[in-house]
Interface confidence: low
């Protein structure tokens, strides 16, 4: 009869390398009498005999993992016990080897030039895969802007136009290589004007071509503005090549103007725009133009900026050597004189003087200034500035103000066109339209009785006689 013998493990467990989905086997050969009970643990947790992922054979000496998963990685131990002596144990590691797998592949990206782009590429594998990137057909080199992060993602700082293209990431270890699908990095570039239109000084009736070139991604659209409004006449030719748009506006010049080229492109829900402007001035006026004694142009001064209608054309009198400068100087001088008048009078007088010195202008073959409507002139003279006007009439019969060399005539109201006869032939003063709704007291006038009132006022505000010819409604 055999003598009892304590268990001895004759083949200690070794480290086992296994690929995912392959079979892995641990051998735990035991010599003992009587036959031992052999149990298995993974990371100190007992493996149950009925677990279908495992096969335990040869009286428990052989543990087979039927289809290895990456979660099977760990320390496996066999323990043998037959009641004689102590239990014995041997342990070995299972290293699950895994070909590279891209778990979060890169996706198509649209990014605005100058911002930061990150293309993801998260991988799995054992040994840990190294990640590299391919742009187009070539390996991508890292530099101060371009880096492959620890996670495998590609980060591009301060994205440039040349970064646009097709990218893929490559995950590689000793067991194999995995490639992501190709993704596209699109770099959107704010609209920018490469070539601004040039200003021209031409003769009346000339043809002029204004050229504006812009770049952007997507390719910008170009629109043209003439004196603040969409160009009403002229032909536009456009040519697009390599993200650059070239727009040419051909004009027949009958008046000076400010022409603005506006390049626009869209980035998601937002737009970017770039603007460039050029002036077209008329050098030699034809006979008919000379007879008009002036031209229409946008007001570019500062004194009347708040008074004149924004972006409207005003009349410049060519009897002055430099009309814009001269008229600005006249109004500047008048402005200083107006500091002395009453708060009621001053804004009305400013509106009157600005609209008289810079009259609204109808362009065309013969530029025509549009005088102030008689009713508005009389409202300033006899209502808003009655006291001041009377005081000045003692000094001069033709104007309000005298300053240094400059005598500033105000219009003779009686000679102005009435808005009732032809509303399109004269200019209204918007300030007075607004003010008539807000005036509650007028200066008392004892020396003369005005011939005009602003209608629709509360009954208590005025007892002036109303002449229907001068009514402003």
């Amino acid at each position: 009869e055999k003598l009892p013998k304590a268990p001895v493990i004759t083949t200690p467990l070794e480290t086992v390398d296994a690929l995912v989905e392959e079979v892995a086997t641990f051998m735990c050969a035991v010599e003992s009498y009587p036959q031992p009970e052999i149990s298995w643990t993974r990371n100190k947790i007992l493996i149950k005999l009925f677990d279908t992922r495992y096969s335990i054979r040869e009286n428990g000496q052989l543990l087979t993992i039927l289809s290895v998963e990456d979660s099977d990685d760990g320390i496996y131990c066999c323990t043998a016990n037959n009641g004689v002596g102590g239990a014995v144990e041997s342990c070995g590691a299972l290293q699950v080897k895994m070909k590279p797998k891209i778990t979060r592949p890169p996706i198509n990206v649209k990014i605005i030039e100058g911002l930061k782009a990150v293309l993801p590429c998260t991988t799995m594998g054992n040994p840990k895969p190294s990640v590299s990137w391919i742009k187009g057909d070539s390996a991508l080199r890292e530099n101060s802007r371009i880096a492959v992060l620890e996670s495998g993602s590609l980060r591009i700082h301060n994205v440039q136009k040349e970064d646009a293209g097709q990218y893929r990431c490559v995950a590689k270890n000793s067991l194999g290589t995995a490639y992501s699908k190709l993704v596209k990095l699109e770099v959107e570039v704010f609209a920018r004007i490469l070539r601004a239109p040039e200003s021209h000084n031409v003769t009346f009736g000339s043809f002029v071509t204004l050229r504006c070139t812009a770049i952007g991604m997507p390719v910008p659209t170009i629109s043209w503005i003439e004196n603040g409004n969409a160009v009403s006449s002229g032909s536009i030719q456009e040519n697009v090549k390599d993200r650059v748009i070239d727009s040419r506006l051909q004009l027949f010049i009958t008046k000076p103007g400010l022409y603005t080229c506006i390049a626009t492109n869209k980035h998601g829900e937002k737009f970017s725009t770039a603007k460039a402007a050029a002036t077209v001035s008329i050098a030699e006026w034809s006979k008919s133009q000379k007879e008009s004694k002036g031209y229409c142009a946008q007001y570019r001064g500062e004194v009347c900026d708040a008074v004149l209608v924004k972006d409207s054309l005003v009349f410049f009198n060519t009897s002055y050597p430099d009309p814009e400068e001269a008229q600005e100087l006249l109004i500047h001088t008048a402005w200083n004189e107006l500091k002395a008048v009453s708060p009621l009078c001053r804004p009305a007088a400013e509106a009157l003087l600005c609209n008289h010195l810079f009259q609204e202008c109808s362009p065309g073959v013969l530029p025509t200034p549009m005088p102030i409507c008689r009713e508005y002139c009389l409202a300033v003279k006899e209502l808003f500035c009655a006291k001041e006007w009377l005081a000045m009439e003692g000094k001069t019969h033709r104007g309000l103000y005298r300053s240094g060399m400059h005598f500033l005539p105000v219009p003779e109201c009686s000679k102005l066109p009435s808005m009732h006869q032809d509303p399109t032939a004269c200019t209204r003063l918007p300030y007075l339209d607004y003010k008539k709704e807000n005036i509650t007291t007028f200066p008392s006038i004892t020396s003369s009785k005005p011939s005009v009132d602003i209608p629709n006022l509360p009954a208590s505000t005025s007892s002036f006689a109303v002449s229907p010819a001068y009514s402003m409604t």
């Epitope: 920018r192 725009t273 603007k275 001064g301 500062e302 600005e328 500047h332």
Partner: antibody
Framework: EVQLLESGGGLVQPGGSLRLSCAAS????????MSWVRQAPGKGLEWVSA????????YYKESVKGRFTISRDNSKNTLYLQMNSLRAEDTAVYYC??????????????WGQGTLVTVSS | QTVVTQEPSFSVSPGGTVTLTCGLS?????????PDWYQQTPGQAPRTLIY???SRHSGVPDRFSGSILGNKAALTITGAQADDESDYYC????????????FGGGTKLTVL
């Protein structure tokens, strides 16, 4: 050659006044906007005030509004900055600078050498 | 209150390229801010380099260029030279409420 020469700086007590002048030459002064820019010792540039070619409007940094007045005399080719109610924080080199065009806010394309204003008791 | 931001300092190797930026504390810098760039060496008056985003001032070498990158104005110096070591300021036209002109805090550029 464009030349801008500032003068009028010096030591003044808090609450006091100074008037800076800038004499311009080498260009048609009346055709250009002008500005004053200052720089506190060891600090950066700070825009103070601007005036267009004809002087009709004036523009100021918020902290100097009501205390400083910019003006120009085109006949004398001179720009001025009247500084009242001076404070210690107004201590700086004050530069006169020419704008690139008539408007008050074109680029600053020519600079003087600066004049030092020290506000201290 | 318009605050214009610049990198306090930057360094570049001789012959290298550097891009200085100029941003707004709230919102983006656009061509409507007409970004201007100025260079100042210690003890000297500023000198204009770039105006209205990308126009080079007369006499300025073409190593200096201006642009808008994303939401900031940028000054790029290519082929940096020892005498480019200076303070660089950007200036922006601001029109929030009232017209004014605001300088950034400046960037001290060191050419190593």
């Amino acid at each position: 050659e464009v030349q801008l020469l500032e003068s009028g700086g010096g030591l003044v007590q808090p609450g006091g006044s100074l008037r800076l002048s800038c004499a311009a030459s080498g260009f048609t002064f009346s055709d250009y906007g002008m500005s004053w820019v200052r720089q506190a010792p060891g600090k950066g540039l700070e825009w103070v005030s601007a005036i267009p070619w004809q002087g009709g409007s004036t523009y100021y940094k918020e902290s100097v509004k009501g205390r400083f007045t910019i003006s120009r005399d085109n006949s004398k080719n001179t720009l001025y900055l009247q500084m009242n109610s001076l404070r210690a924080e107004d201590t700086a080199v004050y530069y006169c600078a020419k704008r690139s065009g008539r408007i008050a806010f074109g680029a600053l394309d020519a600079w003087g050498q600066g004049t030092l204003v020290t506000v201290s008791s | 209150q318009t605050v214009v931001t610049q990198e306090p300092s930057f360094s570049v190797s001789p012959g290298g390229t550097v891009t200085l930026t100029c941003g707004l504390s709230s919102g983006s810098v656009t061509s409507s801010n007409y970004p201007d760039w100025y260079q100042q060496t210690p003890g000297q008056a500023p000198r204009t380099l770039i105006y209205s985003t990308d126009s080079r001032h007369s006499g300025v070498p073409d190593r200096f260029s201006g642009s808008i990158l994303g939401n900031k104005a940028a000054l790029t110096i290519t082929g940096a030279q020892a005498d480019d070591e200076s303070d660089y300021y950007c200036g922006l036209y601001s029109y929030s409420g009232s017209k004014n002109y605001v300088f950034g805090g400046g960037t001290k550029l060191t050419v190593l």
